[in-house]
C-alpha cells in the first residue's frame, strides 16, 4: 500500500514586538520532533498592529485591547484551533517603554498590566509581557540572524542555503536600529571585553561565544531626531530653525512642549522665548551630518576604544547584518544593494537631501508627508552612526549587509527571544539520530 502522510506534527509560537513606534506580532512554526535542530523554526506570519507603540496608550489604556484585536484574531486564524492552548505567547517591549518607565514606573506598569490582561483573554498559552533590556534586545537579534544564517550548525556544507553565507561558522554581527534605541552586537576577535556590562557568554550547540553588545538608548532614529532638534533650537536666533536635514522648501511647525516631552531631550532643555518654532528645510547632507555628529560625545573614553558617550566598543570584526530601521530606511532610499559602496551611498544621500520638497512629494506621492519628510535625516543618521559612531570605514562598509528577511523570517530580536524562552537552543550539540520515519505509515 502507498505511504500516506499523517497530519504534520508541528508547534507554533507567538511573539509581539512592542516597539517605540509600533507593535508587530510574529507567528513561528517548527516540526515538533526537531525542536533542538538548528534552523528549523521559521516565521509563517507577521501582523503589524495598526497604530503607534504601546507607550502612546498611557492616556488610553482602555483602548489597548481593541488595538491588539486584529492581529490576535489573525493569529487565531493562522494557528490551527487544536494547537491554540499549547501555543506560547510572549510580548517584549523595547526602548519606547524603557523611556516611559524612566518617566514613570507606575504608568509603564499600568500599560503592561492592561496588555497582559488583554492577551490573557485569548485561547493561547500567554507567558507574560515585559520590558526587555537593551542587552537582551541586542543578544536576541544576534541569535536570530545567526540561527537563520545557519551559523550554529556544526554540519559543514559544500553548497549555500542562505544569502550572505560565507560557508564558515564565523558568526555575523547584528546592527539593529529602532525608533528609540540602537544595538550593536558581535563576537570580537580575541579581544577582551573591557566593560563587563557589554559582555555576554553563551554556550550554543556545544560551542562557546563571547559576545559584545551595547544598546544606545535615545539613539533610535526618532529619538535622535528629537535630540538633534532640541540641540539645534538652543542656538537658533528666533523661532525659525533652518534645518539641513530636511528638504529645501519643507516647512513644519513644532511645539516646544512636544520637543521636551521625551527624556532623550532633557540634556538640551532650556527656557525658550517662544512656544513654537518652524523648521525650514535647506537640504544639505554635509551640514546635516555635522549636526548629527554633535549628538555623539567622542571627547572622552575610559577604555582602549569607544563608540561614543564613553561606551566601550572593540574593533569591528567580520560581517554584520543591519536590520529593522537600518533596512527599512535604506530600502526606501534604494541603497541596500551589496554593490553600492559607502562613497556611492553618501553621494546618493547628498542628492536626495538636496532635492526640493515639492519634487520629493511628487516622486513619492503615495507616502504620507509625516514619514516622507524624515528620510533625509534618517539616511544621514544611519551613515553618521555607522561611520562615526561605530567606526565602520569605506573599506569595512562592504561587510554590512542590509537585511530585511532571512529565509522568509524577519531579522530582529523576536525569534531569538522565543528560541531562548522555549529552550530551543541547546547548550550542547544534540546527538544526531537517524532520519525519523514516524511521519509515515
Amino acid at each position: 500500500t502507498q505511504n500516506k502522510a499523517l497530519p504534520e506534527n508541528v508547534k507554533y509560537g507567538i511573539v509581539l514586538d512592542a516597539g517605540s513606534s509600533h507593535t508587530s506580532l510574529y507567528i513561528y512554526k517548527w516540526p515538533a520532533e526537531k525542536e533542538n535542530d538548528t534552523g528549523v523554526v521559521h516565521q509563517v506570519e507577521e501582523c503589524r498592529v495598526k497604530g503607534p507603540g504601546i507607550s502612546k496608550f498611557v492616556q488610553k489604556v482602555n483602548e489597548i485591547g481593541i488595538y491588539l484585536t486584529d492581529c490576535m484574531e489573525r493569529a487565531r486564524e493562522v494557528i490551527p484551533r487544536s494547537q491554540h492552548q499549547e501555543t506560547p505567547v510572549y510580548l517584549g517591549a523595547t526602548a519606547g517603554m524603557r523611556l516611559l518607565r524612566m518617566e514613570s514606573e507606575e504608568l509603564a506598569d499600568r500599560v503592561l498590566d492592561v496588555v497582559e490582561r488583554s492577551l490573557s483573554n485569548y485561547p493561547f498559552d500567554f507567558q507574560g509581557a515585559r520590558i526587555i533590556t537593551g542587552q537582551e534586545e541586542g543578544a536576541y537579534g544576534w541569535i536570530t540572524i545567526n540561527y537563520l544564517l545557519g551559523k550554529f550548525s556544526q554540519k559543514t556544507r559544500w553548497f549555500s542555503i542562505v544569502p550572505y553565507e560565507t560557508n564558515n561558522q564565523e558568526t555575523f554581527g547584528a546592527l539593529d536600529l529602532g525608533g528609540a534605541s540602537t544595538q550593536v552586537t558581535f563576537v570580537p576577535q580575541n579581544q577582551t571585553i573591557e566593560s563587563p556590562d557589554n559582555a555576554l557568554q553563551f554556550r550554543l550547540y556545544g560551542k562557546d561565544y563571547n559576545v559584545y553588545t551595547h544598546s544606545f538608548l535615545c539613539y533610535g532614529k526618532d529619538q535622535a531626531l528629537w535630540q538633534k532638534l532640541a540641540k539645534d533650537i538652543q542656538v537658533a536666533s528666533n523661532e525659525i530653525l533652518r534645518d539641513p536635514c530636511f528638504h529645501p522648501g519643507y516647512k513644519k511647525v513644532v511645539n516646544v512642549s512636544d520637543l521636551y516631552k521625551t527624556p532623550c531631550t532633557k540634556r538640551f532643555e532650556m527656557t525658550l522665548p517662544f512656544q513654537q518654532f518652524e523648521i525650514q528645510g535647506i537640504g544639505n547632507y554635509q551640514q546635516c551630518h555635522q549636526s548629527i555628529l554633535e549628538l555623539f560625545n567622542t571627547s572622552y573614553c575610559p577604555y582602549s576604544q569607544c563608540a561614543f558617550n564613553g561606551i566601550f566598543l572593540p574593533p569591528l570584526q567580520g560581517d554584520f547584518g543591519a536590520f529593522s530601521a537600518f533596512y527599512f530606511v535604506m530600502k526606501f532610499l534604494n541603497l541596500t544593494s551589496e554593490k553600492v559602496s559607502q562613497e556611492k551611498v553618501t553621494e546618493m544621500m547628498k542628492k536626495f537631501c538636496a532635492q526640493p520638497w515639492e519634487e520629493i512629494k511628487t516622486s513619492y506621492a503615495g507616502v504620507k508627508e509625516k514619514y516622507l519628510s524624515e528620510y533625509c535625516f534618517s539616511g544621514t543618521y544611519i551613515l553618521s552612526l555607522l561611520l562615526q559612531g561605530y567606526h565602520f570605514t569605506a573599506d569595512s562598509w562592504e561587510h554590512i549587509h542590509f537585511i530585511g528577511k532571512i529565509q522568509g523570517s524577519d531579522a530582529g530580536w523576536t525569534l531569538g527571544y522565543m528560541l531562548n524562552l522555549t529552550n530551543m537552543i541547546p547548550a550542547e550539540q544534540p546527538l544526531s539520530t537517524p532520519l525519523s520515519h514516524s511521519t509515515y505509515v
Epitope: 495598526k50 497604530g51 503607534p52 483602548e63 503615495g366
Partner: antibody, heavy 124, light 112 residues
Framework: QVQLQQPGTELVMPGASVTLSCKAS????????MHWVKQRPGQGLEWIGE????????NYNQNFKGKATLTVDRSSSTAYMQLNSLTSEDSAVYYC?????????????????WGTGTTVTVSS | DIVMTQTAFSNPVTLGTSASISCRSS???????????LYWYLQKPGQSPQVLIY???NLASGVPDRFSCSGSGTDFTLRITRVEAEDVGFYYC?????????FGGGTKLEMK
C-alpha cells in the same frame, strides 16, 4: 461598532469662534488619522486638514490655515476643530472622517467612517 | 491644487439599468508606483458621505460589486450596473495624490 459622533448644530455670531467636537468610539482612537471636511449648502466637499491623534501631527489645506485649528483629546477619544473669525462663508456642514490606510501605515488612505456632521450657522 | 471636475447631473436612469458617472482631474493621478490615487464617495440624501472605491479600482468593504471604476490617469468613469433605488444621491470623485486633497463638485444620480 465604529462611530464618530458630532453635535447637530452650532449657531454663532459673526467674528466669533466655535469649537466643533467629534467623539470616536468602537476603535482605537490614536491608531487612525482624523480628517475634517467642509460642505457648504448645496455645494461639494472641501478638505480642511488632518491630524494624527497619536502625536498631534497636522496638515492643513492652505485655504484654511489661520481659519481652522485641529486638536485631539486622547483621554476622551475626541477630535476638535476650532474655527475663528467666523463669517457667513463659514456657514456649512462640517464632517470629521477617519482615515483607513490598510496595512501600510505610511501610505495615504481613504475616509472609511464619517461623522454625522455639524451644521454651523453664522448669523447675527 | 489638483482640480477635480464632474458634470452636475447624470441622465436620469431606470431601475435595473446601468449608469455611468464621469470625472476628470487636472493632473494625472496615476503614480509611477502603479497606483491611481482616485476615490469615489456617495452621499445619499440627508446622510454623510460614504466611500465606494479607493485607489481607482478597489471596492471598499461592504460595497456591492455592481459598482466599478475605470479610467486613465486623468479621465475616470464610475459604472453602476443594475441600479437600485438606494443608489440615488451625489457621487463625488476625489484625489489624495497631493495635498490638499480635493473633491469634484459632485454628480447627482436620479431615477426616471
Amino acid at each position: 461598532q465604529v462611530q464618530l459622533q458630532q453635535p447637530g448644530t452650532e449657531l454663532v455670531m459673526p467674528g466669533a469662534s466655535v469649537t466643533l467636537s467629534c467623539k470616536a468610539s468602537g476603535y482605537s482612537f490614536i491608531s487612525y488619522w482624523m480628517h475634517w471636511v467642509k460642505q457648504r449648502p448645496g455645494q461639494g466637499l472641501e478638505w480642511i486638514g488632518e491630524i494624527d491623534p497619536s502625536d498631534d501631527y497636522t496638515n492643513y489645506n492652505q485655504n484654511f490655515k489661520g481659519k481652522a485649528t485641529l486638536t485631539v483629546d486622547r483621554s476622551s477619544s475626541t477630535a476638535y476643530m476650532q474655527l475663528n473669525s467666523l463669517t457667513s462663508e463659514d456657514s456649512a456642514v462640517y464632517y470629521c472622517a477617519r482615515e483607513e490606510n490598510g496595512i501600510y501605515y505610511y501610505n495615504k488612505g481613504y475616509l472609511d467612517v464619517w461623522g454625522t456632521g455639524t451644521t454651523v450657522t453664522v448669523s447675527s | 491644487d489638483i482640480v477635480m471636475t464632474q458634470t452636475a447631473f447624470s441622465n436620469p436612469v431606470t431601475l435595473g439599468t446601468s449608469a455611468s458617472i464621469s470625472c476628470r482631474s487636472s493632473k494625472s493621478l496615476l503614480h509611477s508606483n502603479g497606483i491611481t490615487y482616485l476615490y469615489w464617495y456617495l452621499q445619499k440624501p440627508g446622510q454623510s458621505p460614504q466611500v465606494l472605491i479607493y485607489q481607482m479600482s478597489n471596492l471598499a468593504s461592504g460595497v456591492p460589486d455592481r459598482f466599478s471604476c475605470s479610467g486613465s490617469g486623468t479621465d475616470f468613469t464610475l459604472r453602476i450596473t443594475r441600479v437600485e433605488a438606494e443608489d440615488v444621491g451625489f457621487y463625488y470623485c476625489a484625489q489624495n495624490l497631493e495635498l490638499p486633497y480635493t473633491f469634484g463638485g459632485g454628480t447627482k444620480l436620479e431615477m426616471k
